[in-house]
Interface confidence: low
């Protein structure tokens, strides 16, 4: 058993058919000796008396507050979590596998820059008595600070048959150091409750390796006199790193048309324009991707050819 | 030659080498989400490596203070990396082809390397770890390793060189 | 043998100018940056400033900034500390060090400047 | 006032081990800064004993070890001999215009 917060605290169960479980002791936070009663939740049931109650814990309901009084006042709460193990794995029933780099991913995180800010976000279906706590460090063993906010809903969807909701959070590095070259990784940690059960989901990265730039900006079409040829022309996203000089970002441009199975012609640039041959109905694209480094490229910006 | 201590890198060519640089190392191991190397216990590469730090003056403020500071680290990383793509780790079982994106880049490392390296002078440079893995499976994890830690360092430093080829060129 | 020898003891008065040396033989002068570091008496090291002979830029200490110049002539291997008017507060042991990739790695034996009135 | 923190004294009998601390902040030694350390004989210039938080010039004995965690950083001397006698100084690269700051200094005296 530990304390995950002021008077809440998680029991770590081997969760397996009759399981033996683990004994708690709780001890009521008042100077009082005695006349001391124990209930759990909203029942009126007396569980026991004493300054301590011994209670063993096997199952969910097992878990839940329990409460100390005397003489009708309350003296101290203890509310009790379960995190259940399972062949060893601790469960992650809260959270959807999101699939994505690989198996077993559980949260997302994406940084528009080097500045030391990101998101991360994960996707459960459960829409009740949810919460979430996020931590989150750079290096583990020596850990330097990275602010975590609060973790909001940030988007709701359908799913066949289930809705499927996206909680996102956003944390910022206290010391970052965007041109230097990273060593240790941030972990991030989130604490996850669903009624009465607890349950914790990591990450770890670089923030180099989740790097995704906004899409290019003011994307721009200029037809070059009797050709079917046009210089497209575009700039660096305002929240990209500076200076640019610096924090280079290479270029892919595609002309796409009205059919998927089109052939796409293709042109990759490290300047800011391009030229190429606009086709009748085709659209033009380009994304950006940091120039020496190959994390994710950007959405695509797109113009009609028109 | 852009010389640690010197007044006048070759800031262009340092451009054209680093970037090819950039584009070997991950042609040589471009996997990026398909192996989390970290899982698999780093300490004995990663201690060891020249990370270009906080403190170098790599930043565009300190290149332009001063990019000696900052040249010096990246001389020391290209000679760690140089010696490392040459030690059994990359030699031994299984070999690689003579024309690998392996032995471009081993050959790219010197050759950046010895345009930050003044004539006649050897800077020091601290030593690889003592690696030699016995098995060939051992090898080739190693070599991911390393490969990964060297695109990160490679980056930094085309960023440098970038910079300073638009900023600093006389 | 890789050495920074500096000028000898200074008596000065207040008001007076003074500029002392620390030449460096055995290596490459202009490949190596010189710090320059101040001990009152009785006290610890403080960090002035440093210079890179190669191309004299200099980089001050804010305490120490408008107080002294550093300077240097690669032509020579030496490296300058100069004041334009000495207080007694000046009164200290005087270090200049060489840096590289291990920093001030060697130091020279320390100029002893001594301002009374 | 230093910027980064040291003991004023340590002392230790020859043959025992003694470490001395060196306390910063996050623009200095918590910025992923390196921490060096000089040694001091009486009357003498200071000596570079540790560079890069734990790396030992050659010439200076195993029996000198640097560490660094967070925003501080620690020298150990083990098997004390008399000659360690002397003031022991940390220094780092700090944020902003100071480029590098010293520890006060310790005096490490062997009994």
């Known amino acids: 058993i530990w304390e995950l917060k002021k008077d809440v605290y998680v029991v770590e169960l081997d969760w397996y058919p009759d399981a033996p479980g683990e004994m708690v002791v709780l001890t009521c936070d008042t100077p009082e000796e005695d006349g001391i009663t124990w209930t759990l939740d909203q029942s009126s049931e007396v569980l026991g008396s004493g300054k301590t109650l011994t209670i063993q814990v096997k199952e969910f309901g097992d878990a839940g507050q329990y409460t100390c009084h005397k003489g009708g006042e309350v003296l101290s709460h203890s509310l009790l979590l379960l995190h259940k193990k399972e062949d060893g794995i601790w469960s992650t029933d809260i959270l959807k596998d999101q699939k994505e780099p690989k198996n077993k991913t559980f949260l997302r995180c994406e940084a528009k820059n080097y500045s030391g800010r990101f998101t991360c976000w994960w996707l459960t279906t459960i829409s009740t008595d949810l919460t979430f706590s996020v931590k989150s460090s750079r290096g583990s063993s020596d850990p330097q600070g990275v602010t975590c906010g609060a973790a909001t809903l940030s988007a709701e969807r359908v799913r066949g048959d289930n809705k499927e909701y996206e909680y996102s959070v956003e944390c910022q590095e206290d010391s970052a150091c965007p041109a230097a070259e990273e060593s240790l990784p941030i972990e991030v940690m989130v604490d996850a409750v669903h009624k009465l059960k607890y349950e914790n989901y990591t990450s770890s990265f670089f923030i180099r390796d989740i790097i995704k730039p906004d899409p290019p900006k003011n994307l721009q079409l200029k037809p070059l006199k009797n050709s079917r040829q046009v210089e497209v022309s575009w700039e660096y996203p305002d929240t990209w790193s500076t200076p640019h000089s610096y924090f280079s970002l290479t270029f892919c441009v595609q002309v796409q048309g009205k059919s998927k199975r089109e052939k796409k012609d293709r042109v990759f640039t490290d300047k800011t324009s391009a030229t190429v041959i606009c086709r009748k109905n085709a659209s033009i694209s380009v994304r950006a991707q940091d120039r020496y480094y190959s994390s994710s490229w950007s959405e695509w910006a797109s113009v009609p050819c028109s | 030659r852009a010389v640690p201590g010197g007044s006048s890198p070759a800031w262009t060519q340092c451009q054209q080498l680093s970037q090819k640089l950039c584009t070997l190392a991950w042609s040589a191991h471009p996997l990026v989400g398909h192996m989390d190397l970290r899982e698999e216990g780093d300490e004995e590469t990663t201690n060891d490596v020249p990370h270009i730090q906080c403190g170098d003056g790599c930043d565009p403020q300190g290149l332009r203070d001063n990019s000696q500071f900052c040249l010096q680290r990246i001389h020391q990383g290209l000679i760690f990396y140089e010696k490392l793509l040459g030690s059994d780790i990359f030699t031994g079982e299984p070999s690689l082809l003579p024309d690998s994106p392996v032995a471009q880049l081993h050959a790219s490392l010197l050759g950046l390397s010895q345009l930050l390296q003044p004539e006649g002078h050897h800077w020091e440079t601290q030593q690889i770890p003592s690696l030699s893995p016995s098995q060939p499976w051992q090898r080739l994890l190693l070599r991911f390793k390393i490969l990964r830690s060297l695109q990160a360092f490679v980056a930094v430093a085309a960023r440098v060189f970038a910079h300073g080829a638009a900023t600093l060129s006389p | 043998e890789v050495q920074l020898v500096q000028s000898g003891a200074e008596v000065k008065k207040p008001g007076e100018s003074l500029k002392i040396s620390c030449k460096g033989s055995?290596?490459?002068?202009?490949?190596?940056?010189i710090g320059w570091v101040r001990q009152m008496p009785g006290k610890g090291l403080e960090w002035m400033g440093i210079?890179?002979?190669?191309?004299?830029?200099?980089r001050y200490s804010p305490s120490f900034q408008g107080q002294v110049t550093i300077s240097a002539d690669k032509s020579i291997s030496t490296a300058y500390l100069q004041w334009s008017s000495l207080k007694a507060s000046d009164t200290a042991m005087y270090y200049c060090?060489?840096?590289?990739?291990?920093?001030?790695?060697?130091w020279g034996q320390g100029t002893l400047v001594t301002v009374s009135s | 006032q230093s910027v980064l923190t040291q003991p004023p004294s340590v002392s230790g009998a020859p043959g025992q081990r003694v470490t001395i601390s060196c306390t910063g902040s996050s623009s200095n030694i918590g910025s992923g800064y390196d921490v060096h350390w000089y040694q001091q004989l009486p009357g003498t210039a200071p000596k570079l004993l540790i560079y890069g938080n734990s790396k030992r010039p050659s010439g200076v004995p195993d029996r000198f070890s640097g560490s660094k965690s967070g925003t501080s950083a620690s020298l150990a001397i083990t098997g004390l001999q008399s000659e360690d006698e002397a003031d022991y100084y940390c220094a780092s690269w700090t944020d902003g215009l100071s480029l590098v700051v010293f520890g006060g200094g310790t005096k490490l005296t062997v009994l």
């Open positions: 210079i890179d002979p190669s191309n004299s830029y200099t």
């Open positions: 055995g290596y490459s002068f202009s490949n190596y940056w």
């Open positions: 060090a060489r840096w590289y990739y291990k920093p001030f790695d060697v």
